[in-house]
Amino acid sequence: HAPEDPSDLLQHVKFQSSNFENILTWDSGPEGTPDTVYSIEYKTYGERDWVAKKGCQRITRKSCNLTVETGNLTELYYARVTAVSAGGRSATKMTDRFSSLQHTTLKPPDVTCISKVRSIQMIVHPTPTPIRAGDGHRLTLEDIFHDLFYHLELQVNRTYQMHLGGKQREYEFFGLTPDTEFLGTIMICVPTWAKESAPYMCRVKTLPDRTWT
């Protein structure tokens, strides 16, 4: 039978999505116990039937990976969790409407920072996602977000930063002092979806100038 309050068994059912990896998470309520089991279903907007997620039926962990099941970028999804306690009490809760394009957050980019004598080069590597194109190959963030660009900053000293930005993958900050340490930060920006990744940071030192030795 249903508990007096579903929140006694189950709370905070939500998608946590990063770079299109979509994980359903939840918490047990105050009356949840370690032997409470959880079963997960999902569906798309306007569909009547919930689909049971294989591998996430009568589980005791509090997360379920729904990346594959929620992989259509233009679709809206829901998931719901049914908790059943050892005593047979049950509660069901569903997520808010989930759009991976809208709700996914961006991880820091993968960047290689290369020291030179009077410059620092930064090479941004394409970010793969679990989303697959029609021919089966994995799409990168750049494939998905056509207005994606990179914002790069080099902290020269406490009061001066140099900035670069664009859609290309290779950047270089010139005119630097040799044998000096700099802090670089690189972020991914997607204006149309108001997305900004956490920064990738690299602390790099320009090479000593050997021309006078």
Epitope: G46, E75, T95
Partner: antibody
Framework: EVQLVESGGGLVQPGGSLRLSCAAS????????MNWVRQAPGKGLEWIGE????????TYNQKFEARATLTVDQSKNTAYLQMNSLRAEDTAVYYC?????????WGQGTLVTVSS | DIVMTQSPDSLAVSLGERATINCKSS????????????LAWYQQKPGQPPKLLIY???SRESGVPDRFSGSGSGTDFTLTISSLQAEDVAVYYC?????????FGQGTKVEIK
């Protein structure tokens, strides 16, 4: 069997407020979205808004956003519509209706009459 | 807001004859992810709440007689009652759920001639 039963209608003075209840039975309220729709006498249907009873997340028709508040009490399996600053044109039958897009189950409705 | 316009406002049809109700939306209701149209049809009898007949423009709700069918795509939709029965006397509404706010047509009253 899924059932939705509205209550709380009646005569309200202009400028007053109402709080309507929608008691769900036959399913857990938190397993689906709940909507409110109204129908003025002899008129068509007008969507007021929706709530996800699991999270409390609401979406309102902009026309009602300033005056309507949707809430739920999960422990009572009941959804609520509060409407303020009522005027004569708010006289209508108010329905709660289940689902997230179209509406598969409706309550029988409760009549609200705004008059002095 | 998407405006839904039904025609005609009322319709008188002989028992056993076909009744056709049209619904036009002010913008396309084609939902790209499933290539279906976000349109529903309801039947409302006096003193009763609306009853869902059709969703996704052409999917019949469980328990609804097969004389009711929905068709159309984009902005133009039709509800057809292939052989009108006495119990079909009612007001019929279309509703879009493509975008907020959800909106209904003004209704079409079906009577027996």
């Amino acid at each position: 069997e899924v059932q939705l039963v509205e209550s709380g209608g009646g005569l309200v003075q202009p400028g007053g407020s109402l709080r309507l209840s929608c008691a769900a039975s036959g399913y857990s309220l938190t397993a689906d979205y709940m909507n409110w729709v109204r129908q003025a006498p002899g008129k068509g249907l007008e969507w007021i808004g929706e709530i996800n009873p699991s999270t409390g997340t609401t979406t309102y028709n902009q026309k009602f956003e300033a005056r309507a508040t949707l809430t739920v009490d999960q422990s009572k399996n009941t959804a609520y519509l509060q409407m303020n600053s009522l005027r004569a044109e708010d006289t209508a039958v108010y329905y709660c209706a289940r689902f997230d897009a179209y509406f598969d189950y409706w309550g029988q409705g409760t009549l609200v009459t705004v008059s002095s | 807001d998407i405006v839904m316009t039904q025609s005609p406002d009322s319709l008188a049809v002989s028992l056993g004859e076909r009744a056709t109700i049209n619904c036009k939306s002010s913008q396309s209701l084609l939902y790209s992810s499933n290539q279906k149209n976000s349109l529903a049809w309801y039947q409302q009898k006096p003193g009763q709440p609306p009853k869902l007949l059709i969703y996704w423009a052409s999917s019949r709700e469980s328990g609804v007689p097969d004389r009711f069918s929905g068709s159309g795509s984009g902005t133009d939709f039709t509800l057809t009652i292939s052989s009108l029965q006495a119990e079909d006397v009612a007001v019929y509404y279309c509703q879009q759920y493509f975008s907020y706010p959800f909106t209904f047509g003004q209704g079409t009253k079906v009577e027996i001639k």
